[in-house]
Amino acid sequence: HNTTVFQGVAGQSLQVSCPYDSMKHWGRRKAWCRQLGEKGPCQRVVSTHNLWLLSFLRRWNGSTAITDDTLGGTLTITLRNLQPHDAGLYQCQSLHGSEADTLRKVLVEVLADPLDHRDAGDLWFPGESESFEDAHVEHSISRSLLEGEIPFPPTS
């Protein structure tokens, strides 16, 4: 799976979209999880309604919401009041049994609020994040991770 980068501004909302084949994943609940380390587990943040037919209903866990357009085949995650600690690698997942298929790998980048004059030193960006050749604007800026980019900050 390629990684898609979604960028949002600190303090604002970020919408992440994950398209999928609606027939291939028919009847399956979806989830949004956060990758813990490069080879670590993906920790569940929020999942769609327990009843698949009600997947269109928005479910919240803290400041993160999930909703699923099961006919159109688009899973949408909203990160409200984006904070620097929200930056990192995530996955959209399709659940079957107790297993999960990855629909999309997502790198969330948090940009400093240009109107906020406080020190932005605690905002983390993976290397080369200034490169926007492939960016396209949806509800957020998103692009595919470029070759050589690291989805995790280097560990010392």
């Epitope: 027939m23 291939k24 009847g27 049994g97």
Partner: antibody, heavy 123, light 107 residues
Framework: EVQLVQSGAEVKKPGESLKISCKGS????????IAWVRQMPGKGLEWMGI????????RYSPSFQGQVTISADKSISTAYLQWSSLKASDTAMYFC????????????????WGQGTLVTVSS | DIQMTQSPSSVSASVGDRVTITCRAS??????LAWYQQKPGKAPKLLIY???SLQLGVPSRFSGSGSGTDFTLTISSLQPEDFATYFC?????????FGQGTKLEIK
């Protein structure tokens, strides 16, 4: 009417190759996963693997990974199971089965089965 | 892999009897379990899915229960056409393993 029709019985020698088929009708073939299941003579059922004909996404059981190849051609609504070099121990009945996901369950079950293809490998 | 163990491996019963077959998973599988019936020379037939949901067209004398690791298939009043082999299968993880089967014979 949903139907899965499998190819006929085969008698082969060890080392030979073989490809058996499973043709679906009465439903949108490309939109349902297809599983392959082995049943050796007088024995139980063994799950071999599964394929989504829509994009040929395949999952194998570790026991069968590298031993067989599962493929599909959605344009002719057919799934395949093939061997490059048969062994006597491959002698068995092979079933294909359509996988159905039930909207309140989020897992899949084999709701329609083919009639089976008997493969006999003997020198 | 998840191991599925059925008991008994065979059972003799008469028409009209109530029969219970059990299936135990080597680890918790929630309610992701199916029961199949197979007659000699035929393909298996789905009876129960999601541990307790009756497949369309299957007689109501068949019922399933259980969750986690222990499951049962019950036939409330045996009919002549019910004499067959029954398999459980977990739908929790790949590979989707089956129990070894329970042969239901006429007493």
């Amino acid at each position: 009417e949903v139907q899965l029709v499998q190819s006929g019985a085969e008698v082969k020698k060890p080392g030979e190759s073989l490809k058996i088929s499973c043709k679906g009708s009465g439903y949108s073939f490309g939109s349902y996963w297809i599983a392959w299941v082995r049943q050796m003579p007088g024995k139980g059922l063994e799950w071999m693997g599964i394929i989504y004909p829509g994009d040929s996404d395949v999952r194998y059981s570790p026991s069968f990974q590298g031993q067989v190849t599962i493929s599909a051609d959605k344009s002719i609504s057919t799934a395949y199971l093939q061997w490059s070099s048969l062994k006597a121990s491959d002698t068995a009945m092979y079933f294909c089965a359509r996988q159905r996901t039930f909207y309140y369950d989020s897992s899949d079950y084999s709701d329609y089965w083919g009639q089976g293809t008997l493969v006999t490998v003997s020198s | 892999d998840i191991q599925m163990t059925q008991s008994p491996s065979s059972v003799s019963a008469s028409v009209g009897d109530r029969v219970t077959i059990t299936c135990r998973a080597s680890q918790g599988i929630s309610s992701w379990l199916a029961w199949y019936q197979q007659k000699p020379g035929k393909a298996p037939k789905l009876l129960i899915y999601a541990a307790s949901s009756l497949q369309l067209g299957v007689p109501s004398r068949f019922s399933g229960s259980g969750s986690g690791t222990d499951f049962t298939l019950t036939i409330s009043s045996l009919q002549p056409e019910d004499f067959a082999t029954y398999f459980c299968q977990q739908a929790d993880r790949f590979p989707r393993t089956f129990g070894q089967g329970t042969k239901l014979e006429i007493k």
